[in-house]
């Protein structure tokens, strides 16, 4: 014969524990039902009656099976430098993250405490290390043979186009200008963008070596804050 299935509430066998989605009520000394996510315990169980659960009220939630008397309050509305990436529902708390083009300059256990705009590399400088959710962009000077003519937190240094005859030589902040209508080949058809990271988990982007028509003398600016005068700017 199959073992008898006990219905909550029931007294557990000595030395045994309650089953999944049940908890041991010290007062009743019984195994009782937990409430599902999105609910809370309205009335605790007794020896003869099981837990009575009720739905969480607006702006409150429970994420796990539980027997809490009150649901948890959802966090405050997102600050103006943040966006809501997960709404407050009966089963999950609101999640706020820094808005696009910003990163978390100071993270705390409960989320991002301070968001800051990603550093923009100015003309003559390109992105050496892209920004992540928790780290700023690192800029580097464009090496000989490469340039960047934008103020951007995503553009890297691009190689100068190769000309049959050069009208104006390129420099760190300007592409070469050719005399003929079309260059023999262009290695830089358009601005190269580094994608904004979606998540920083397991993301360890290394700056990619950039093609150069001249010996590279590029260097990374310090890991810490790179001086704004050295190729980065504010918003």
């Amino acid at each position: 014969l199959p073992a008898q299935v006990a219905f909550t509430p029931y007294a557990p066998e000595p030395g045994s524990t309650c089953r999944l989605r049940e908890y041991y009520d010290q007062t009743a000394q019984m195994c009782c039902s937990k409430c599902s996510p999105g609910q809370h315990a309205k009335v605790f169980c007794t020896k003869t009656s099981d837990t009575v659960c009720d739905s969480c009220e607006d702006s409150t939630y429970t994420q796990l099976w539980n027997w809490v008397p009150e649901c948890l309050s959802c966090g405050s509305r997102c600050s103006s430098d943040q966006v809501e990436t997960q709404a407050c529902t009966r089963e999950q708390n609101r999640i706020c993250t820094c808005r696009p083009g910003w990163y978390c300059a100071l993270s705390k256990q409960e989320g991002c405490r301070l968001c800051a705009p990603l550093r923009k590399c100015r003309p003559g400088f390109g992105v050496a290390r892209p920004g992540t959710e928790t780290s700023d962009v690192v800029c580097k000077p464009c090496a000989p043979g490469t340039f960047s003519n934008t103020t951007s937190s995503t553009d890297i240094c691009r190689p100068h186009q190769i000309c049959n005859v050069v009208a104006i030589p390129g420099n760190a902040s300007m592409d070469a200008v050719c005399t003929s209508t079309s260059p023999t080949r262009s290695m830089a058809p358009g601005a190269v963008h580094l994608p904004q990271p979606v998540s920083t988990r397991s993301q360890h982007t290394q700056p990619t070596p950039e093609p150069s028509t001249a010996p590279s003398t590029s260097f990374l600016l310090p890991m810490g804050p790179s001086p704004p005068a050295e190729g980065s700017t504010g918003d």
């Epitope: 600050s79 609101r94 300059a105 100071l106 993270s107 705390k108 989320g111 810490g224």
Partner: antibody
Framework: QVQLVQSGAEVRKPGASVKVSCKAS????????VTWVRQAPGQGLEWMGW????????HYAQNLQDRVTMTTDTSTSTAYMELRSLRSDDTAVYYC?????????????????WGQGTTVTVSS | DIVMTQTPLSSPVTLGQPASISCRSS???????????LSWLQQRPGQPPRLLIY???NRFSGVPDRFSGSGAGTDFTLKISRVEAEDVGVYYC?????????FGPGTKVDIK
């Protein structure tokens, strides 16, 4: 006890640079951030910028963005503020103050510890 | 940027009498973590600023209980229940809810 000790007064000519230091003691330096504030003679307080001593992340006031750099040396528990291309209106007392950081999990207090101030005079 | 305004800008008070300073922010200072990062600082003549109140109403250690802070959202008040001679100075409200941190213009408290 917890304190921030700043470097001495400086006199500079317009166009020059100045680097002010702020040495922390009595607490774990990398558990907090450092904020820099300045005060021109007879004026109010102006926030200059902030540096997370653990990560090196910075944020500067927009009007100073192109001229200021804040750094830390964790080996000596010292924060630095460098201001370049000095002008006469940069004449002020410069303060560093401790702010919360990634490791300060206790209650938030705000700018609870201040340096004594460093007078920077810009004059030709 | 969040703009902080203070009233009055000057407050001559009689010793032993109460004083009140108002501070208003151009937008709510409630952070998504539920905290409101509004502080009050005191600056006595010739001295660096000193933290009095943090997160609207919490007195910092060593601050006399005659100082109290209140408010919510965008409107905040610092009260001195009985002004003493050592309370002379300039009082600033400041927000650190988001970058850039901003100060009020300051309120000068002196004795009549």
């Amino acid at each position: 006890q917890v304190q921030l000790v700043q470097s001495g007064a400086e006199v500079r000519k317009p166009g020059a640079s100045v680097k002010v230091s702020c040495k922390a003691s009595g607490y774990t330096f990398t558990s907090y951030s450092v904020t820099w504030v300045r005060q021109a003679p007879g004026q109010g307080l102006e926030w200059m910028g902030w540096i997370n001593a653990f990560s090196g992340n910075t944020h500067y006031a927009q009007n100073l963005q192109d001229r200021v750099t804040m750094t830390t040396d964790t080996s000596t528990s010292t924060a630095y503020m460098e201001l370049r291309s000095l002008r006469s209106d940069d004449t002020a007392v410069y303060y560093c103050a401790r702010e919360e950081g990634s490791g300060s999990y206790e209650d938030y207090y705000g700018m609870d510890v201040w340096g004594q101030g460093t007078t920077v005079t810009v004059s030709s | 940027d969040i703009v902080m305004t203070q009233t009055p800008l000057s407050s001559p008070v009689t010793l032993g009498q109460p004083a009140s300073i108002s501070c208003r922010s151009s937008q709510s200072l409630v952070h998504s973590d539920g905290n409101t990062y509004l502080s009050w600082l005191q600056q006595r003549p010739g001295q660096p600023p000193r933290l009095l109140i943090y997160k609207i109403s919490n007195r910092f250690s060593g601050v006399p209980d005659r100082f109290s802070g209140s408010g919510a959202g965008t409107d905040f008040t610092l009260k001195i229940s009985r002004v003493e001679a050592e309370d002379v100075g300039v009082y600033y409200c400041m927000q650190t809810t988001q970058f850039p941190f901003t100060f009020g213009p300051g309120t000068k408290v002196d004795i009549k």
